[in-house]
């Protein structure tokens, strides 16, 4: 399974902070950021970076203890840009993360100085056993840039 | 003010088990991490592990792992941690401390640390 | 794991003197989310450790302003601009960016 969050300020479940998704061993968490077409918003673009971070971190929006670890950066608001994170027990890269069944996992953004944007805060749900590829339903939309 | 009191000194048998406890005072137990540290004379301090009361979220050291197993009981804001196939290795004082969060990040308040001593 | 190592063991001094402790780990310190979790405690005789410094240079509450510490990357010290007798004990580094968190071997502050 595949689960795209569309991650930026107009998803209000991201916005408000209970947007869960419940995730298998070998699903991919796909996060697409923020894009643009001609100008933008006059605010200017929403740019970030995502981080993994505890509860205490989630809960305060904070990724500035020793278990906030920057992933993503979306700093290019004309572009496509998309990252993914493999739900998998063991990762083979060393910045990887290993992701175990029953748990839960935390991501927020944090906005750049510049950006227009708002704290995103999201939960990942990881559950009992592997799939197989398909996709699944997005968080958002691509309209909600 | 904030307290950590630790349990008495134990003194057990080669491949027993202890569970030694730290009780928590003068702050919300739930919001902060307990970590457990070891020290043996002459040989530093090593890090065990931390443990959340907020979720009871754990992590270990792989050296301890399947040998320390932290919990705790938030009713009575103490933390436990069990120590398990001991060997003469193991004996040390084991030492709990809370970490304060932003912008620290650092274990502020200790106990005042529990004597294990692994003999027949 | 990361191997953090001090130096001196140990480090003779006379009162009023300046100490300056050594930390190197063997490698960066510096966190994926930027920040540098690197700290120093003082653990005198029959006591727990002390915080004294945390997040290589800010000194906690408490902590009297002759101690400081500086750094970045692998390379740590601690300073004492002038050392009194409730200073004496062992001073270990410890990071908190890698996991295990691990600490250094101590060094110990004594009376020439």
């Known amino acids: 399974l595949r689960h795209v969050v569309y991650w930026n300020s107009s998803n209000p479940r991201l916005l408000r902070g209970d947007a869960v998704v419940e995730l298998g061993l070998n699903d991919y968490l796909d996060i697409v950021c923020p894009h643009y077409e001609g100008p933008g918003p006059p605010e200017g673009p929403e740019t970030f970076a995502l981080y993994m971070v505890d509860w205490p971190g989630y809960e305060s929006c904070q990724a500035e203890g020793p278990r906030a670890y920057k992933r993503w950066v979306c700093s290019l608001p004309f572009g496509h840009v998309q990252f993914s994170e493999k739900i998998q027990r063991f990762t083979p890269f060393s910045l990887g993360f290993e992701f175990l069944p029953g748990e839960t996992y935390y991501y927020i953004s944090v906005p750049t100085p510049e950006s227009s944007g708002q704290c995103l805060r999201l939960q990942v749900s990881v559950c009992c056993k592997e799939r197989k590829s398909e996709s699944a339903h997005p968080v958002g939309s691509p309209g909600e840039s | 003010q904030i307290q950590l009191q630790q349990s008495g000194p134990e003194l057990v048998k080669p491949g027993a088990s202890v569970k030694i406890s730290c009780k928590a005072s003068?702050?919300?137990?739930?919001?902060?991490?307990i970590h457990w540290v070891k020290q043996r004379p002459g040989q530093g301090l090593e890090w065990i592990g931390w443990?959340?009361?907020?979720?009871?979220?754990?992590k270990y050291n792989e050296r301890f792992k399947g040998m320390a197993t932290l919990t705790v009981d938030t009713s009575s804001s103490t933390a436990y941690m069990q120590l398990s196939s001991l060997t003469s290795e193991d004996s040390a004082v084991y030492l709990c401390?809370?970490?304060?969060?932003?912008?620290?990040?650092?274990?502020?308040?200790w106990g005042q640390g529990t004597s294990v001593t692994v003999s027949s | 794991d990361v191997v953090m190592t001090q130096t001196p063991l140990s480090l003779p001094v006379s009162l009023g003197d300046q100490a300056s402790i050594s930390c190197r780990s063997s490698?960066?310190?510096?966190?994926?989310?930027?920040?540098?979790?690197l700290y120093w405690y003082l653990q005198k005789p029959g006591q727990s450790p002390k915080l004294l410094i945390y997040?290589?240079?800010n000194r906690f509450s408490g902590v009297p302003d002759r101690f400081s510490g500086s750094g970045s990357g692998t390379d740590f010290t601690l300073k004492i601009s002038r050392v009194e007798a409730e200073d004496l004990g062992v001073y270990f580094c410890?990071?908190?960016?890698?996991?295990?968190?691990?600490f250094g071997g101590g060094t110990k502050l004594e009376i020439k």
């Open positions: 401390a809370r970490e304060d969060g932003s912008p620290y990040y650092a274990m502020d308040y």
């Open positions: 003068g702050y919300t137990f739930t919001g902060y991490y």
């Open positions: 443990i959340y009361p907020g979720n009871f979220n754990t």
């Open positions: 490698q960066s310190l510096v966190h994926s989310n930027g920040n540098t979790f």
């Open positions: 997040r290589v240079s």
């Open positions: 410890f990071q908190a960016t890698h996991v295990p968190w691990t």
